[in-house]
């Protein structure tokens, strides 16, 4: 059974709840306050606030906490006053600002083009597995299937245009059913949020940080969990979406319109297709079960062809075999007949880096994700400091009052709305939910905007990339029109059930409240954040593929099981919140349970060991590479160490010292603190050498 | 250029069999079909079968299946025909022709051998 | 088997003159016939391909059309070495089968 976060020892209390954890607490936890007692004792303790039902994390043993850590955190100015400065000092301030604006916007820059290259290098590595998936005969009888595919292969190519294109190709040639298609559209919904997600990692540096940034990029994916949970169900019954649609598709005569307008890759695309170019039609073709495609590569090696339609004799087992009777002959020994075939002819090479490598597609793919990865962090990394740097006083305060503040009464309630519009419209000026979502996740992450407002940015991005999809199918071929159309359609009524389901009713929105637990759990527990990517976005899909692969009989023997267990616990967890009067002693609370199934503490212990082992030849690297780099200026103090490392030299020699959060993921000393040992530190620490 | 060449006349008896030439040069012997048609005054031309010398298959025109056979040596680039239990009705001008590539129209003709069936 | 009627035996022109020769099939052939010209004591020689394309060598005078059923192979004007039996062969299928020919004569 997956770990649970701390259940035990809380004491209901419905009227308050406590929806922090560990990380920046001011001080350290009162020892006094606890009582000496093993987890499996039932004896009465100290009270703490426990979180409602509907939250993921209640931790044992917390103090409460007298911040709030969702409360957005003052960046206080440290510099001198304008009015202070003289000239001299005024122009320089002036000339700092504009160079601190050239370089977000430089960063911001390399930032989107890494994402860019992340999902060509996810496609390298994926893109023709991720076809495979698609040519499985079963999607047209299994929703579920189709879902799950549509989240791998959106993960795995980090696109869902990528994979909503398929999709439509494959409607458009018959070889797959728009009903058979929504599920999978549903599934690219879901994928594509994975992106922002991996952008919050990037920011794990920083537990308070962190916190902000993971719950504000997982609040796109409980979003789309929700939404399909509620909504396929509910299509799988009635078809609404496809009626609709089709309705929509019927009564309209829609006549071929112009692409979509792409205003952001105008921008990035002169870099991108220096780094890499790739040729998608071979994932579609792979999933039309075209042969040929398996072998050809990602990597487009010609960008300038001569394609010439010409008609060629070609030889046929019989006349049955002819095009016509009338383009049918024979040698006098074979039939020939004629036919219409594309001659292409290469005439100039593309100029990117791999194109006379002739690397494999995973090799390629292994270096681009690799370097992405890295751009992208080191990108993160300048942008977050840039922004701290210049949101501070009250640049700071303007900037979050205009963001987070609502419209005065009785209007309060259109903010959100306007919120909702403004990420569609940015959405769509960027042409990427992913990109757009990715931007917004180290703004929530550094405190500028609120979860609660980027909720409503998130769910308008959703819209935007439909109204794109939308703009895109009207411009498709004549064939392709009416099924890409119907299933940009499908896309856009689907994310606008979510929004009526998830938005609109302040106490309907779950994924706020959701994301904030996870963030909690992220926070004190920094690899759970991994683990959460791995299982939801990965094994769970996974899973149901191969059991849905195994056959329905096998789906519904493992599935009902789970989903019957899941339902027991949420019903139990909702009585020990709401009224555990109701249930008997043993079950007002987990400790009926094993340790290591009701806390993350014993799994903590397990992943501290792999990573701490993992951490000491970090930092004895990052040491050596220092004192190498100080010895080439000759400077001694012209950059440190990783702080990190001498915290963990320290709390391995016993030492009771603050410990700061790692680049990487919590060692033997965070999972002390998580035990109370050690009080927690706020403060960041730069793991870069600067 | 191309030629065909054929020997100009066959005198058999009856019963008896009659195995004609065509010999080829002036082009890859091996690329294109060799046709064989049968010329009586009156029954005008008669497609007898062809023979792909690259690699052997033939085609037989229902009427001269069983007694024609086409062979084809590469090593010479020579085409064979063989017509076996002669009659009187054999009595004609048989010619090799070169099929054009990819169809069946005959662009150079051998000048034709005549077989005369007595006895 | 494909039948290819020539409905004239013999036709008789003038040096100069233009000359229509006919050829009919007994079903669809499409464009898959061929029309040759055989002068007396010598091998046919291929004159059109694909019912309208002229052999390498072969003069302008020689046209050929038609598609389907009918054909005809047209000599513009007639010269005194035109004289010869023309015939059309078919290679829609096999077996290949040719007109019985068409003798054209000096008035």
């Known amino acids: 059974m997956a770990p649970w976060p701390e259940l035990g020892d809380a004491q209901p209390n419905p009227d308050k709840y406590l929806e922090g954890a560990a990380g920046q607490q001011p001080t350290a936890p009162d020892k006094s306050k606890e009582t000496n007692k093993t987890d499996n004792t039932e004896a009465p303790v100290t009270k703490i606030e426990l979180l409602p039902s509907y939250s993921t994390a209640t931790l044992i043993d917390e103090p409460t906490e007298v911040d709030d850590p969702w409360n957005l955190p003052t960046l206080q100015d440290s510099g001198i006053k304008w009015s202070e400065r003289d000239t001299k000092g005024k122009i320089l301030c002036f000339f700092q600002g504009i160079g601190r604006l050239i370089l977000l916007l430089g960063f911001l820059y390399f930032f989107v083009c890494s994402l860019d290259i992340l999902s060509s290098a996810f496609q390298l590595v994926g893109g023709k597995m991720a076809g495979q998936f698609f040519s499985n005969s079963s999607i047209m009888s299994n929703p579920l299937l189709g879902l799950v595919i549509g989240v791998l292969v959106t993960v795995l190519v980090q696109s869902s245009s990528t994979s909503t294109s398929i999709v439509v190709s494959m409607v458009s040639s018959s070889l797959l059913t728009v009903r058979a298609a929504i599920p999978i559209i549903m599934g690219a919904n879901i994928g594509t949020s994975i992106t922002n997600t991996i952008v919050a990692l990037m920011q794990v540096g920083d537990r308070s940080e962190f916190r902000r940034a993971f719950a504000g990029a997982t609040v796109h994916d409980f979003f789309n969990w929700l939404s399909v949970l509620v909504l396929l169900p509910v299509e799988v019954a009635t078809h609404y979406l496809e009626i609709i649609t089709q309705l929509i598709v019927e009564s309209f005569h829609f006549k071929n319109g112009e692409d979509a307008p792409d205003l952001l890759k105008v921008i990035t695309k002169p870099f991108t297709k220096l780094i890499v170019q790739l040729d998608k039609k071979v994932i579609s073709q792979i999933a039309m079960n075209d042969e040929k495609a398996k072998n050809k590569s990602l990597v487009k090696i010609w960008c300038k062809t001569f394609t010439n339609k010409t008609q060629i004799n070609v030889t046929v087992p019989s006349t049955a075999n002819c095009t016509s009777p009338s383009l049918c002959w024979t040698d006098g020994i074979q039939n020939w007949t004629m036919k219409n075939v594309t001659y292409k002819e290469n005439i100039a090479k593309c100029q990117h880096i791999f194109v006379n490598f002739h690397l494999p597609d995973l090799a390629v793919g292994t270096i681009l994700l690799i370097l992405s990865l890295l751009v992208l962090c080191g990108c993160l990394i300048m942008i977050v400091k840039i922004l701290g740097s210049v949101l501070k006083g009250q640049v700071a305060t303007v900037i979050k009052k205009t963001i987070n503040t609502d419209f005065p009464f009785p209007f309060a309630w259109l903010t959100g709305y306007l919120a909702i519009l403004v990420g569609a419209g940015m959405t769509f000026i960027v042409q990427s939910s992913s990109v757009f979502t990715s931007a917004l996740t180290p703004l929530i992450g550094i405190g500028v905007i609120t979860i609660e407002r980027a909720y409503p940015l998130t769910l308008g991005s959703n819209i935007g990339t439909t109204t794109t999809a939308i703009l895109a199918a009207l411009a498709s071929p004549g064939n392709a029109l009416r099924s890409s159309l119907q299933i940009a359609l499908c896309h856009f009524f689907f994310n606008i059930s979510g929004i009526l389901l998830w938005y609109p009713i302040p106490f309907t929105r779950l994924p706020i409240r959701m994301a904030k637990g996870l963030g909690n759990i992220s926070a004190k527990y920094r690899w759970f954040a991994v683990f959460y990517l791995i299982i939801f976005f990965f094994l769970i899909p996974l899973t149901v593929f191969g059991l849905s692969l195994a056959g329905w009989r096998v789906l519904v023997g493992v599935g009902v099981p789970v989903v019957f267990i899941i339902i027991l616990v949420l019903c139990l967890r909702l009585l020990q919140s709401r009224c555990p009067r109701v249930l008997p002693k043993k079950l007002q609370n987990w400790n009926f349970l094993p340790l290591w199934m009701r806390s993350l503490k014993p799994w903590d212990a397990v992943v501290s060991k792999f990573t701490g082992c993992f951490q000491m030849r970090c930092c004895c690297c990052c040491r050596v590479c220092c004192r190498a780099c100080c010895l080439l200026c000759d400077c001694p103090k012209c950059c440190r160490c990783s702080k990190c490392c001498e915290d963990l030299e320290e709390a391995q020699e016993g030492q009771d010292v603050p410990v700061k959060a790692p680049e990487t993921f919590d060692n033997i000393t965070i999972s002390r603190e998580a035990q109370g040992e050690v009080p927690a530190s706020d403060s960041k620490t730069e793991c870069t050498a600067l | 250029q191309v030629q065909l060449q054929q020997p100009g006349a066959e005198l058999v008896k009856p019963g008896a069999s009659v195995k004609m030439s065509c010999k080829t040069s002036?082009?890859?012997?091996?690329?294109?079909?060799m046709h064989w048609v049968k010329q009586t005054p009156g029954q005008g031309l008669e497609w007898i079968g062809a023979?792909?010398?690259?690699?052997?298959?033939?085609a037989y025109n229902q009427k001269f299946k069983g007694k024609a056979t086409l062979t084809a040596d590469k090593s010479s680039s020579t085409a064979y025909m063989q017509l076996s239990s002669l009659t009187s009705e054999a009595s004609a001008v048989y010619y090799c022709?070169?099929?054009?590539?990819?169809?069946?129209?005959?662009?150079?003709w051998g000048q034709g051998t005549s077989v005369i069936v007595s006895s | 088997d494909i039948v290819m009627t020539q409905s004239h035996k013999f036709m008789s022109r003038s040096v100069g003159d233009r000359v229509r020769i006919t050829c009919k099939a007994s079903?669809?052939?499409?464009?898959?016939v061929a029309w040759y010209q055989q002068k007396p004591g010598q091998s046919p020689k291929l004159l059109i391909y694909?019912?309208?394309t002229r052999h390498s060598g072969v003069p302008d005078r020689f046209t050929g059309s038609g598609s389907g059923t009918d054909f005809i192979f047209t000599i513009s004007n007639v010269q005194s070495e035109d004289l010869a039996d023309y015939f059309c062969?078919?290679?829609?299928?096999?077996?290949?089968?040719f007109g019985a020919g068409t003798k054209l004569e000096l008035k």
């Open positions: 694909w019912a309208t």
């Open positions: 079903q669809d052939v499409g464009t898959a």
């Open positions: 062969q078919q290679y829609s299928s096999n077996p290949l089968t």
């Open positions: 023979i792909y010398p690259g690699n052997g298959a033939t």
């Open positions: 022709a070169r099929g054009m590539y990819g169809h069946g129209a005959m662009d150079y």
């Open positions: 002036g082009y890859t012997f091996t690329t294109n079909n």
